[in-house]
Interface confidence: medium
Amino acid sequence: GITIPRNPGCPNSEDKNFPRTVMVNLNIHNRNTNTNPKRSSDYYNRSTSPWNLHRNEDPERYPSVIWEAKCRHLGCINADGNVDYHMNSVPIQQEILVLRREPPHCPNSFRLEKILVSVGCTCVTPIVHHVA
Amino acid sequence: GITIPRNPGCPNSEDKNFPRTVMVNLNIHNRNTNTNPKRSSDYYNRSTSPWNLHRNEDPERYPSVIWEAKCRHLGCINADGNVDYHMNSVPIQQEILVLRREPPHCPNSFRLEKILVSVGCTCVTPIVHHVA
């Protein structure tokens, strides 16, 4: 693999915890320089597999609010605006990292946590199981 | 509002940085216990707005590998398997948190960074702008 020399200006690490507990600066750097600031796009209404956005809030987590997509229909919306059950609306899921306060209610101590969130829905052709 | 008492067992905070710099335990807790192991599903191929997955790797970031979706077509796949340009394939984007080594190459010091990733694609009705 690539061996990158350690920066001599790094903070000291306590060997017993290293590198399990690290220092993290919460002043977030935003790489999304060229994105449209109006990010709450209306795809959730315009999609052929539309979805609702449900709030998932946990004050012990950072970010505290996550919006979860729930597909509105089992099928997909056809050209006539009706639900076509020959197709399926399915959630697109992604694993994301969040910070969980640990111990609970501590403002400056967290643990990394991985959670699975549904980001939106897409319309797929169903898998048909033929009975012999 | 809700006032939750601070846990007396919290690590001390250095006031000059608090709460900008926090301690984070990197032993990841995975909440996805009851999820379907077939998460790397074939939706990207079966969708009416199919997508390709591109690997984005950065050793100075945690997680170092992120998969980015790119829609295959401008239009959507119709019932005949052809691309219908009266509909649009669009990426569903999600802002995620990652850890960026800061200063660079330091094993135990990070900064939170948010990046916008495309998770998959969905098929939407286009917005038609009528010219007066």
Epitope: N52, P63 | G1
Partner: antibody, heavy 117, light 112 residues
Framework: QVQLVQSGAEVKKPGSSVKVSCKDS?????????MSWVRQAPGQGLEWIGD????????FYGEKFEDRVTLTADTSTNTAYMELSSLRSEDTAVYYC?????????WGQGTLVTVSA | DVVMTQSPLSLPVTLGQPASISCKSS???????????LNWLQQRPGQSPRRLIY???KLDSGVPDRFSGSGSGTDFTLKISRVEAEDVGVYYC?????????FGGGTKLEIK
């Protein structure tokens, strides 16, 4: 106790813009709690404008306001901002910032914006 | 969008008597995480709104225990066991389960 202190009343001409600020006294949690903006026209009910997570800059807008409102935050001063452009007479209202767990637990004192020719 | 319908529009109550306000939503407010993000606000004349209840039934700190919230799914109720003079104002229900957030039209509580 959390205190949200908003900027003073404004009188604006139709077509112009207004920027309302909201300073949060709670330096401990504010960078990682959503800040919401709500408005109330004279004698009317409450209307949600949008949310911003100050530290992330993650923004959600109500559809009605999406084209005209810009929410921003300065985490170094714990201040959130709401800018509304292309003002019309029906934008005359008291604008509130609010934040806290599970929705709006704490509210600012409100900023009256009057749009008049 | 979720429509929140409050009743009654106006509620005249005698001091010391109970009061009840109903709030109905056009779709279930049970979130994907099992929580129901239904809240009640009080707005006294000339003041900013103040949250009384969150997650259907949890009282905010400093809210007298004569206030209580109940309900599930699409039907919710705010009750005041014994109305006091300081309770005069407009009460709003609002949901933050679904995007975008929506408020009820308000119920004006006044003393008979």
């Amino acid at each position: 106790q959390v205190q949200l202190v908003q900027s003073g009343a404004e009188v604006k001409k139709p077509g112009s813009s207004v920027k309302v600020s909201c300073k949060d006294s709670d330096s401990t949690f504010s960078p990682i709690v959503y800040m919401s903006w709500v408005r109330q026209a004279p004698g009317q009910g409450l209307e949600w404008i949008g949310d911003i997570l100050p530290s992330l800059g993650r923004i959600f807008y109500g559809e009605k306001f999406e084209d005209r409102v810009t929410l921003t935050a300065d985490t170094s001063t714990n201040t959130a901002y709401m800018e509304l452009s292309s003002l019309r007479s029906e934008d005359t209202a008291v604008y509130y910032c609010a934040r806290g767990d599970y929705g709006f637990a704490y509210w600012g004192q409100g900023t009256l914006v009057t749009v008049s020719a | 969008d979720v429509v929140m319908t409050q009743s009654p529009l106006s509620l005249p109550v005698t001091l010391g008597q109970p009061a009840s306000i109903s709030c109905k939503s056009s779709q279930s407010l049970l979130g994907s995480d099992g929580k129901t993000y239904l809240n009640w606000l009080q707005q006294r004349p000339g003041q900013s709104p103040r949250r009384l209840i969150y997650l259907v039934s949890k009282l905010d700190s400093g809210v007298p225990d004569r206030f209580s919230g109940s309900g599930s799914g699409t039907d919710f109720t705010l009750k005041i066991s014994r109305v006091e003079a300081e309770d005069v104002g407009v009460y709003y229900c609002w949901q933050v389960t679904h995007f975008p957030y929506t408020f009820g039209g308000g119920t004006k509580l006044e003393i008979k």
